[in-house]
């Protein structure tokens, strides 16, 4: 049986315009930290979605170490005690309050690197992460809702005569399939109790001069196309993974 | 039982400094806890005015910054207060209190323990 | 800077009654509200932090609620100890801030 043939020019694309890929850190730049600080600063989010297994590091506002008290992390994921990573720069010390994942860190010493860091995303990592920079002046945000995104597994065949079937399986968030050329399809989402979803779209195609069609499954962590030759043969299944 | 008790001249005149002083018995201020002065107006409006840490760090009310100073003596077990260029508008009780400390100290900043406070009148 | 309004300036009640004092904040302080009493020529006395906590050695009638900007102490069940000033005071951020102050008197 013939593999389904990938398009190359689609095929995981990551343009580095797209949010989602271009980078796993929002940090500023050190020469962007601010002296004369603002309260334009005071609470800023920002909806986050990065690659499962890549590293991310999450970033404090841009306030100078010397203008500090303390630096805390609030780390809230689904179904668990909201954790706290806490430090306070007259005593150099910190604290945790109900943080048990180890794969969330501190970048480096408070003291020098404010950031923190989940090394290999899970899905598990989905949430809201919120740094609080406590000054003389107030008290400075910066809060991530972090998207654990994962790529779905693509498949297509065809099942029988005239009829394929393109499968994105176990993806977050769900995959779109969409066709080329356009046949009579019905579309099933099936959720996962891990929060990823598989996506099935069947397809028919009634008119006998389409002998090729293609699949082409969108997805924030890039795009896969697979095309079919579909082969009016009785009873036969043709079948295809993609690689 | 840790005591707070506040000192210093009750009568201060305009564009002069003030100067207090809180002595502290029953705990060593360089073993914890953030200490800080309080006032309350005529009116009874309160202010915070800054703390100083077991450290030596301190921290002030940016409303105060470019006239006050708390320091400390370590072996008197005392901490000061020093107020430049008071006005009338300085009248107030003085009050010392330390900081209460929980288990995680980002939100620790009230006062469990306070002296009786001492009035200072600013006028000429 | 968080500026807490406090209310009623003044509130007048019987022993055995139940009184609140309300507090509001000009921004989200989450819990962290404290609450004390005064009494002419005593120290000040630390009643409640965090919003609900209440502090050893502050006695059951007293309670606090609230969160975000709203805040509330309940005294139920009045003593006559418990007539003189609160004040309530965010804890989330500095500058430290205090209310204006409510005076309990008997009625």
């Known amino acids: 049986e013939g593999a389904a043939q990938p398009n190359n020019s689609l095929m995981l694309q990551t343009s580095k315009e797209n949010h989602a890929l271009a980078s796993s850190s929002l940090c500023m730049d050190e020469k962007q930290i601010t002296q004369n600080y603002s309260k334009v600063l005071a609470e800023v989010n920002t909806s986050w979605p990065v690659k499962m297994a890549t590293n991310a590091v999450l970033c404090c506002p841009p306030i100078a170490l010397r203008n500090l008290i303390i630096i805390t992390w609030e780390i809230i994921l689904r179904g668990q005690p909201s954790c706290t990573k806490a430090y306070k720069k007259e005593t150099n010390e910190t604290k945790e309050t109900n943080c048990t994942d180890e794969r969330i860190t501190w970048v480096s010493r408070p003291d020098q690197n404010s950031d923190l860091q989940i090394r290999t995303v899970a899905i598990t990592h989905d949430g809201y992460y919120r740094c609080i920079m406590v000054t003389p002046d107030g008290n400075f945000h910066r809060g991530y809702h972090l998207q654990v995104l994962v790529t779905p597994e693509v498949t297509l065949f065809q099942n029988r005569n005239r009829t394929a079937v393109c499968k994105a399986v176990a993806g977050k968030p769900a995959a779109h399939i969409s066709w080329i050329p356009e046949g009579d399809c019905a579309t099933k989402q099936e959720y996962w109790s891990n929060g990823t979803v598989t996506v099935k779209s069947t397809c028919h195609w009634e008119v006998h001069n389409v002998s090729t069609v293609t699949c082409h499954v969108s997805h924030l962590t890039g795009n896969k196309s697979l095309y079919i030759e579909l082969l009016p043969v009785p009873g036969a299944k043709k079948s295809a993974k993609l690689y | 039982e840790i005591q707070l008790q506040e000192s210093g001249p009750g009568l201060v005149k305009p564009s002069q400094s003030l100067s207090l002083t809180c002595s502290v018995t029953?705990?060593?201020?360089?073993?914890?806890?953030?200490w800080s002065w309080i006032r309350k107006f005529p009116g009874n409006k309160m202010e915070w005015m800054g703390y100083i840490g077991f450290s030596g760090s301190t921290v002030y009310n940016p409303s105060l910054n470019s006239r006050i100073s708390i320091t400390r003596d370590t072996a008197k077990n005392q901490f000061f207060l020093q107020l430049n260029s008071v006005t009338t508008e300085d009248t107030a009780t003085y009050h010392c209190?330390?900081?209460?400390?929980?288990?995680?100290?980002?939100?620790?900043?009230?006062?469990?323990?306070w002296g009786p406070g001492t009035m200072v009148t600013v006028s000429s | 800077d968080v500026r807490m309004t406090q209310s009623p300036s003044n509130l007048a009640a019987s022993p055995g009654e139940s009184v609140s004092i309300n507090c509001k904040a000009s921004k989200n302080i989450s819990k962290y509200l404290a609450w004390y009493q005064q009494k002419p020529g005593k120290a000040n006395r630390l009643l409640i932090c965090s919003g609900s906590t209440l502090q050893s050695g502050t006695p059951s009638r007293f309670s606090g609620s609230g969160f975000g900007t709203d805040f509330t102490l309940t005294i139920r069940n009045l003593e006559p100890e418990d007539f003189g000033l609160y004040y309530c005071?965010?804890?989330?951020?500095?500058?430290?801030?205090f209310g204006s102050g409510t005076k309990l008197e008997i009625k």
């Open positions: 005071q965010q804890h989330n951020e500095f500058p430290l801030t």
């Open positions: 209190a330390k900081s209460f400390v929980q288990n995680t100290f980002i939100y620790d900043w009230f006062f469990d323990f």
């Open positions: 029953g705990f060593t201020i360089t073993s914890g806890y953030d």
